[in-house]
């Protein structure tokens, strides 16, 4: 059967200054390839967050994404900004050259309360 | 620079037990899975044993399974492994490495040697 | 197990290919040079292709179903060594080893 991505939160709302957690589940491991978080759809959509690389400025993974049964893609924001609003995506790709784009999850919009 | 540094190889009798230490420097230890990989005189590479970043989760190959303990302190960015029973098949190179995001391996330390001997 | 020839020889500037066959699409596959026994190995490539930013151009490294390939364009002396493939399975969170490519520059 094929992978489903959960992200079993609709919408989620955080005063300015603070962080917040988006969650997102897989249902396999398989088949193999990496999962990235993106804001918005389409051709102008921002990569936030990838679990192949570290970098990622206020971003930080929920659960310890290197047990090798993780099923968890949950990301922290930390220090949450109004440019922050918007909807997220956890999606999952398949290995390739280059990696393809299997399945996302069903979104979640994020609300940035002024403080 | 990321840098590897086993230590803790010894000439023991079967049957012994020996703890292997890899310190880590230059990178994260914390965010980071780890795994001892070891080679025999004159054969390939063998992965022994894995280790989540939390330290939580721990992975063994067969042929240690049940006599080797895989550890790490990440306030001490110090990995570890524990070997009980041991026998003349696990005189080897022994290896620390740091895992990819996908469980394979970017940097290896210089190694460190087993010998098991009567 | 992974399986990849045990040997394979060029001249100065030619191409080497080595593939490794056997991990399952259910693998990522890595390349790791040895250049004297019990020497530290050297990651050239992870992830299928990913190549570490001090590991020089002329290694790359593909994968097409269960089988990956290393190809050396312009294969120099100093890359005589033993090449390991390695992979991961997602299935049964095991690295595996083949046996290793010894290569000798004519």
């Known amino acids: 059967t094929e992978v489903k991505v959960i992200q079993p939160e609709k919408s989620v709302s955080v005063a300015a200054g603070d962080s917040t957690v988006l969650n997102c589940t897989l249902t396999s491991l398989l088949p193999v390839g990496p999962i990235r978080w993106y804001r918005g759809v389409g051709q102008s959509r921002q990569l936030i967050y990838s679990f192949t690389t570290e970098h990622f400025p206020r971003v930080t993974n929920v659960s310890d994404a290197t047990k090798r049964s993780n099923l968890d893609f949950s990301i922290r924001i930390s220090n949450v900004t109004p440019e922050d609003a918007g909807t997220y995506y956890c999606v999952k790709f398949q290995r390739g050259s280059p990696d393809t784009e299997i399945q996302s999850g069903g979104g979640t919009e994020v609300y940035v309360l002024a403080k | 620079d990321v840098q590897l540094v086993e230590s803790g190889g010894a000439v023991v009798r079967p049957g012994e037990t020996l703890r292997l230490s890899c310190t880590a420097s230059?990178?994260?230890?914390?965010?980071?899975?780890m795994s001892w990989v070891r080679q025999a005189p004159g054969k390939g590479l063998e992965w022994v044993s894995g280790?989540?970043?939390?330290?939580?989760?721990?992975y063994y190959a067969d042929s240690v399974k049940g006599r080797s303990t895989i550890s790490r302190d990440n306030s001490k960015n110090t990995l570890y492994l524990r070997m009980s029973s041991l026998t003349a098949e696990d005189t080897a190179v022994y290896y620390c490495?740091?895992?990819?995001?996908?469980?394979?391996?970017?940097?290896w330390g210089l190694g460190t040697l087993v010998t098991v001997s009567s | 197990a992974l399986t990849q020839p045990a040997s394979v020889s060029a001249n100065p500037g030619e191409t080497v290919k080595i593939t490794c066959s056997g991990g399952?699409?259910?693998?990522?596959y890595g390349w790791y040079q040895q250049k004297s026994p019990g020497s530290a190995p050297v990651t050239l490539i992870?992830?299928?292709?990913k190549r570490p930013s001090d590991i020089p151009s002329r290694f790359s490294g593909s994968a097409s179903g269960s089988t990956a390939t290393l190809t050396i364009t312009g294969v120099q002396v100093e890359d005589e060594a033993v090449y390991y493939c390695?992979?991961?399975?997602?299935?049964?969170?095991?690295?595996?080893f083949g046996a290793g490519t010894t290569l000798t520059v004519l």
């Open positions: 490495a740091r895992e990819t995001w996908n469980h394979l391996f970017d940097y």
């Open positions: 230059g990178f994260t230890f914390s965010s980071y899975a």
């Open positions: 280790i989540s970043a939390s330290g939580s989760d721990t």
């Open positions: 399952g699409t259910s693998s990522y």
């Open positions: 992870h992830s299928d292709d």
């Open positions: 390695g992979g991961y399975d997602y299935t049964t969170y095991v690295n595996t």
